[in-house]
């Protein structure tokens, strides 16, 4: 049984290959049974996390995984070596880096080692399954009286993300935001003295190195201005 | 740079009261405004209480009325008085300073307190 699995994954364009092992109809079998579905994703390409929904098991079932890389030099079937954990029955399996292949097609195999015939096996394309850890070190710098530039950090190569800023006066309900290419750095040309402003980045692993939908959890706030204050006197300035 | 520790959080009732502390310390004098934020399990962080260098507070309505933020010069702390407390005011509080050096902005973090309101 070949189909095609779309999910949120990154992976829309591949075809995962199931092979469900169906019993005749009039013996209904725990093979029959479809497997969940695993989701994969490689975080700041330092490890991947392999999930499944153990809970979708009609009864608690400690599913294994093997995975390999397709037509490559890392191509040996390779067994989980550490299983992640949902109230005691495995619902994931992490690899550590050295085992991530960004560029090569990643094959995930799950099984039910009570039933070896039920068995499913997915495709992935690492690459657009990376999510980079939230921007760091916030910093504006004031260029002018009315215009301001915003620099970040990842923990990642600058080249492979793109990000997306967003900002808002007071503690306003609804954020403007800008897509911002690798140069990782957002000017906002024109700010109102008299208005506090919020500022957060979050990054993505598109379009250069990767085809990866998820964003990075938001940067930590960064703040500037105030209708209260021009910059001094400064909140502890008898400490100065 | 600037170091901010927070301190003060803890379990208690629903209705009841509690006091968070955050004490900075470091280049103090480049700070201009302090202020609290807090984030509930699979929430995004959103912003408490403020409190800039004229003793201007500021506040959401979501707590508006229940939480009171000030300051201690002399100690470089800042407070932030909580009553009234709901359930839904379960959430990490952060400190956070905002830093001016020169011409260049940042704001600094505390590692966070645990508040526990319980039914």
């Known amino acids: 049984l070949n189909t095609t699995i779309l999910t949120p994954n990154g992976n829309e364009d591949t075809t995962a290959d199931f092979f469900l092992t169906t019993m005749p109809t009039d013996s209904l079998s725990v093979s029959t049974l479809p497997l969940p579905e695993v989701q994969c994703f490689v975080f700041n390409v330092e490890y991947m996390n392999c999930t499944w929904n153990s809970s979708s098991e009609p009864q608690p079932t400690n599913l294994t995984l093997h995975y390999w890389y397709k037509n490559s030099d890392n191509d040996k079937v390779q067994k989980c070596s550490h299983y992640l954990f949902s109230e005691e029955i495995t619902s994931g399996c992490q690899l550590q880096k050295k085992e991530i292949h960004l560029y090569q097609t990643f094959v995930v195999q799950l099984q039910d080692p009570r039933e070896p015939r039920r068995q499913a096996t997915q495709m992935l394309k690492l690459q657009n399954l990376v999510i980079p850890w939230a921007p760091e070190n916030l910093t504006l710098h004031k260029l002018s009286e009315s215009q301001l530039e915003l620099n970040w950090n990842n923990r990642f190569l600058n080249h492979c993300l793109e990000h997306l800023v967003q900002y808002r006066t007071d503690w306003d309900h609804s954020w403007t935001e800008q897509s911002v290419d690798y140069r990782h750095k957002f000017s906002l040309p024109s700010v109102d003295g008299q208005k506090r402003y919020t500022f957060r980045v979050r990054s993505r692993f598109n379009p250069l190195c990767g085809s990866a939908q998820h964003w990075s959890e938001w940067s930590h706030p960064i703040h500037w201005g105030s209708n209260t204050s021009k910059e001094n006197p400064f909140l502890f300035a008898l400490e100065a | 740079q600037v170091q901010l520790q927070e301190s003060g959080g803890g379990l208690v009732q629903a209705g009841g009261s509690l006091r968070l502390s955050c004490a900075a310390s470091g280049i103090t004098s480049s700070i201009y405004a302090m202020g609290w934020y807090r984030q509930a399990p699979g929430n995004e962080r959103e912003p408490v209480a403020l409190i800039t260098s004229g003793d201007n507070t500021n506040y959401p309505d979501s707590v508006k009325g229940r939480f009171t933020i000030s300051r201690d010069t002399a100690k470089n702390t800042v407070y932030l008085q909580m009553s009234s407390l709901k359930p839904e005011d379960t959430a990490v509080y952060y400190c956070?300073?905002?830093?001016?050096?020169?011409?260049?902005?940042?704001?600094?973090w505390g590692q966070g307190t645990l508040v526990t309101v319980s039914s």
């Open positions: 956070y300073a905002d830093v001016v050096i020169g011409t260049t902005y940042y704001t600094s």
